[in-house]
């Protein structure tokens, strides 16, 4: 079972001092960001017992394996169900604590009831404050049963549940009709999935015989030991004030485990710590009683004395739970309660025994779960003990379970059961992930999901060039870190596979699926320089560059031109996709802007060194368009244009440009300059008769401005073919600018 304990501090005089702590003894518990261990969760479960909303509870993490809930402001905050969730994957386990109000109308005689499938469970609610109304029993918040208040027996209301089955498990409550739910008695019923002493899918396996109030888990056959006891069968008591599967945890505070309720994974439930009893776990055991809730009786023999935490303390010469075994009887010594091996390994198992007469090699045997008996291959005889060594045949999964070491002499016999866990070495289910690549290295994340058992002790990354028959290169890495594969060949595909290992001999799993990772191509090394540039308009720039001459083919796929507009903090990138190109036209630039310009060679995704930068100032944009352009035919070869000056001019106009085009014609338009910017009319001469023309114009300051609207007009009559249009502004002749 998962080593998870939920502690409730029951010193209830002040709810603000109340706290719940969840402690995990699991390796890697609570490391939230760690892929190998989800965090511990501790929360109030309001699904069944709803209490009035209060200020949020405070959760504090103390290291990786402990979490504490505080911030209870009033007694009603405490009433209800709390749960702690810990363990990873299939071992994820929920531990539940049910808190009753000490001032409730009804109080449970016993909160947690663990029963076997088919048993009769009896829940008993003791009357604390009588009401003369019905008592309503509920199961998981839903109506279950009604009792008349007259039906109380010795001041208790009993709910009998015959032939219980696992679905009957849950939270039960007894409440007076119409009383506050906070005045209810709350119970937890845990129904094991098997009958007494059995476990496994078909309940065919026999429980190990848990001692000291331990409860046999119906899924894995392990004993869930009460707080303060340890060992495969809970046979060993912890030192006072200690708990956890290996007695590794210590009760907080000076009074040890007094006033603490301990909740453990099902099917154990909750109890006081060893040596304590009572609804608030503040009463010491009466003489002759010991253990959790003081449920155990000592019955010590041969002069043994009863310790309320550990049971019988035997005088020298005697051992056993009740000091009933003479030290002359052989005794198995220091047998580990749990051993772990990897699948298909052939481990050696040692079993030591002492006694009078002295055990010899043939008197110690090892029994597997299937009943097979192994005899020791050798024995080491020392003055105080004999250690038999057993060579175990290749392990299979069915070997998981309880093994037994047995010693027999004429003085008697002893046996010790221990749990063997056969673990499956982990096998990656996915290929590793490529994080970044360069021409000679790959950065890989080896963390992948896996089948089999953890924890992961090492990760091996195997790699070699794709389609190669050469040996694989191997790198051993930490499970939680990314790996850099170095000294690789550029532009080469590598097959990369992960192999995971768990602790112990034979813990290496099979290799995971391969993935193809390709190194980048070589970095371009040549540095271009800018030959020159010239402005082709307010928003256009032609740039040319050169490369140094080097022998051999050019390493590059093209060029990247970068324009940096420092005023606006904007960068413009232009990709020139031919490595032979030495010139480029940049369009759509911002007029009047100061740019810093550079060029660099690129190859695949890699950039070479940038050229020394150049600084370029684009001319500002031209003025707005002239307004109200109007055309009127004067003769068969002349059309007069009139307009109004543009509004909001940034400076004095240097000239106007008129564009003339035959309507529907396919030829290029003609541009005619009007060099007298103060004019607002001009005559275009030399036009063809009876021809429809299109006109538009724009002004120029430092650069050409926006075009005006386009106007249409036809020349008059059927005159001679003219040589081509010319322009006259008032009486002055103007040249033609095409």
């Amino acid at each position: 079972a998962v080593d998870l304990t939920l502690l409730a501090n029951l010193r209830l005089t002040d709810p603000q001092r109340f706290f719940l702590t969840c402690v995990s003894g699991e390796a890697g518990a609570g490391r939230g960001s760690d892929a190998w261990g989800p965090p511990l969760l501790l929360e109030k479960d309001d699904r069944i017992v709803r209490t009035p909303p209060g200020p949020p509870l405070r959760l504090a993490r103390n290291g990786s394996h402990q979490v504490t809930l505080r911030g209870f402001s009033k007694p009603s905050d405490l009433v209800g169900v709390f749960s702690c969730v810990g363990g990873a994957g299939a071992r994820r386990t929920r531990v539940i604590y049910v808190h009753n109000s000490p001032g409730a109308h009804l109080l449970p005689d016993k909160v947690t009831h663990t029963v076997n499938k088919g048993d009769t469970a009896v829940l008993s609610a003791r009357v604390h404050k009588e009401k003369q109304t019905d008592v309503i029993w509920k199961s998981n918040g839903s109506y279950f049963y009604t009792l008349d208040w007259h039906e109380a027996q010795d001041g208790r209301f009993l709910l009998q549940l015959p032939n219980v089955q696992p679905p009957s498990s849950g939270i039960y409550s007894a409440t007076y009709l119409e009383a506050s739910p906070l005045g209810s008695a709350f119970f937890r019923l845990i129904v094991r999935g098997c009958g007494a002493g059995r476990w496994g899918p078909g309940c065919t396996k026999e429980c190990p015989g848990c001692l000291h109030g331990g409860v046999c888990h119906d899924h894995d056959g392990e004993c869930v030991c009460p707080p303060g006891f340890t060992g495969t069968r809970c046979e060993q008591a912890c030192r006072e004030g200690r708990f956890g599967q290996s007695c590794q945890e210590q009760c907080p505070g000076i009074s040890g485990c007094r006033g603490l309720t301990f909740c453990l994974p099902d099917p154990y439930g909750c109890s006081c710590g060893s040596g304590w009893r009572g609804s608030q776990c503040q009463e010491a055991c009466a003489p002759g009683h010991f253990g959790a809730d003081c449920r155990l009786q000592c019955q010590c023999q041969n002069g043994g004395t009863c310790d309320r935490f550990s049971g019988c303390v035997c005088p020298s010469g005697w051992h056993g739970v009740h000091c009933e075994k003479s030290d002359r009887i052989p005794q198995i010594l220091n047998m580990a309660s749990e051993l772990e091996f990897n699948l298909e390994t052939m481990p050696r198992i040692n079993c030591a025994a002492a006694g009078n007469p002295f055990p010899v090699r043939g008197s110690i045997e090892l029994r597997k779960p299937d009943g097979t008996v192994l005899l020791s291959t050798k024995a080491i005889v020392e003055p105080e003990k004999t250690t038999a060594e057993f060579e175990v045949p290749r392990l299979v999964l069915a070997d998981s379970g309880f093994w037994e070491c047995r010693v027999s002499t004429s003085g008697g016999q002893d046996s010790r059961r221990f749990k063997v866990n056969v673990k499956v070495p982990p096998v990656p289910l996915a290929a590793p992930r490529l994080l970044t690549k360069q021409s000679r290295q790959l950065v890989v994340s080896p963390l992948v999901s896996f089948s089999g058992d953890g924890p992961i002790s090492t990760v091996r990354l195997h790699y070699r060039p794709q389609d190669s028959t050469m040996d694989w290169s191997t790198i051993v890495v930490d499970p939680s870190e990314n790996v850099t594969l170095m000294n690789l060949r550029p532009k080469t595909g590598y097959s990369v596979r992960v192999q995971l290992s768990r602790p112990g001999e034979g813990g290496e799993g099979a290799w995971g699926p391969p993935t193809l990772m390709t190194t980048d191509c070589p970095e371009p090394l040549l540095q271009p320089w800018l030959e020159g540039w010239h402005v082709e308009g307010t928003d256009r720039l032609r740039v040319s560059w050169s490369l140094p001459l080097v022998p051999g083919p050019l390493v590059g796929d093209g060029f990247l031109l970068r324009l940096w507009d420092g005023t606006r903090g904007q960068e413009r990138r232009e990709n020139v996709s031919s490595p032979q190109a030495r010139t480029a036209l940049l369009t759509g630039l911002t007029p009047g802007t100061h740019y810093q310009l550079d060029v660099q060679l690129y190859h695949c995704t890699l950039l070479g060194p940038a050229s020394p930068p150049a600084h370029v100032l684009l001319p500002p944009s031209g003025p707005p368009a002239p307004r109200h352009l109007h055309a009127q035919a004067l003769s068969d070869s002349e059309i007069q244009l009139t307009w109004k000056h543009p509004e909001a001019l940034p400076g004095p106009i240097s000239k106007y440009v008129v564009e003339v085009q035959v309507a529907g014609g396919a030829g290029d338009p003609l541009w005619i300059d009007v060099d007298r910017p103060e004019e607002t009319s001009t005559i275009i001469r030399g036009l063809n008769a009876s021809t429809r023309y299109l006109f538009r114009m724009r002004a120029s300051i430092q650069g050409l401005g926006d075009w005006s609207n386009t106007v249409e007009e036809s020349t008059l009559g059927n005159g001679l073919q003219a040589e081509g249009p010319v322009q006259e502004s008032r009486a002055a002749e103007e040249g033609l600018d095409q």
């Epitope: 003369q132 109304t133 019905d134 309503i136 109506y143 279950f144 049963y145 009604t146 009792l147 008349d148 007259h150 039906e151 009709l177 119409e178």
Partner: antibody
């Protein structure tokens, strides 16, 4: 689906006896408190009696105390009302009802009892 | 013993809303009550339980048009978007030591 089906009603002379039955289905009968409620023609509802799940405790309205007996057979999922010394004022439709936390949450369709000479 | 008072009749138009009242006798203003509907020639049907704080728990299959509320010693049943099948007798009911108590009922007519 919860169903309650009353039977056993009919015409009876004053002073006579009648036994009503209520067959329950669709729920765990043995866990619920059960009741009888009656309704005289054109009148409102009047509670008659109830019985606890175990059958060990019963209550009656003053108007029927000593004359009527409520009982149940949990193995047959059936509720009964034994009515003795019937009077004209006992004429009514008798409904059986399942109680949940103080109130009837399911009712039967009723059976008519007529006490007349 | 608690007494429950209901007005004998109420009426409202099809599609409109109606609010029925049940008054608890003095000293019983903290009691919860239940509402039951009885359509003509049928057995009663449980609608909902209404607590003194106005919270209510409806029976299985009761439409959202039915809601309960509370003010002092008064308990209310509100039916919105009235339909012709809502024409029925409505009884309030409470419980005490050893008995159930019903109100006299309100006959609701849908116009």
């Amino acid at each position: 689906e919860v169903q309650l089906l009353e039977s056993g009603g009919g015409l009876v002379q004053p002073g006579g006896s009648l036994r009503l039955s209520c067959a329950a289905s669709g729920f765990t009968f043995s866990r619920y408190k059960m009741s009888w409620v009656r309704q005289a023609p054109g009148k409102g509802l009047e509670w008659v009696s109830y019985i606890y799940p175990s059958g060990g405790h019963t209550e009656y309205a003053d108007s029927v105390k000593g004359r009527f007996t409520i009982s149940r057979d949990n193995s047959k999922n059936t509720l009964y009302l034994q009515m003795n010394s019937l009077r004209a004022e006992d004429t009514a439709v008798y409904y059986c009802a399942r109680e949940r936390e103080g109130t009837p949450d399911y009712w039967g369709q009723g059976t008519l009892v007529t006490v007349s000479s | 013993q608690s007494a429950l008072t209901q007005s004998p009749s109420a009426s409202a138009s099809l599609g409109a809303s109606v609010k029925l009242t049940c008054s608890l006798s003095s000293g019983h203003s903290s009691y919860a009550i239940a509402w039951h509907q009885q359509q003509p020639e049928k057995g009663p049907q449980y609608l909902m339980k209404v607590n003194s704080d106005g919270s209510h728990t409806k029976g299985d299959g009761i439409p959202d048009r039915f809601s309960g509320s509370s003010s002092g010693a008064e308990r209310y049943l509100t039916i919105s978007s009235l339909q012709s099948e809502d024409e029925a007798d409505y009884y309030c009911q409470t419980w005490g030591t050893g008995s159930w108590v019903f109100g006299g009922g309100t006959k609701l007519t849908v116009l």
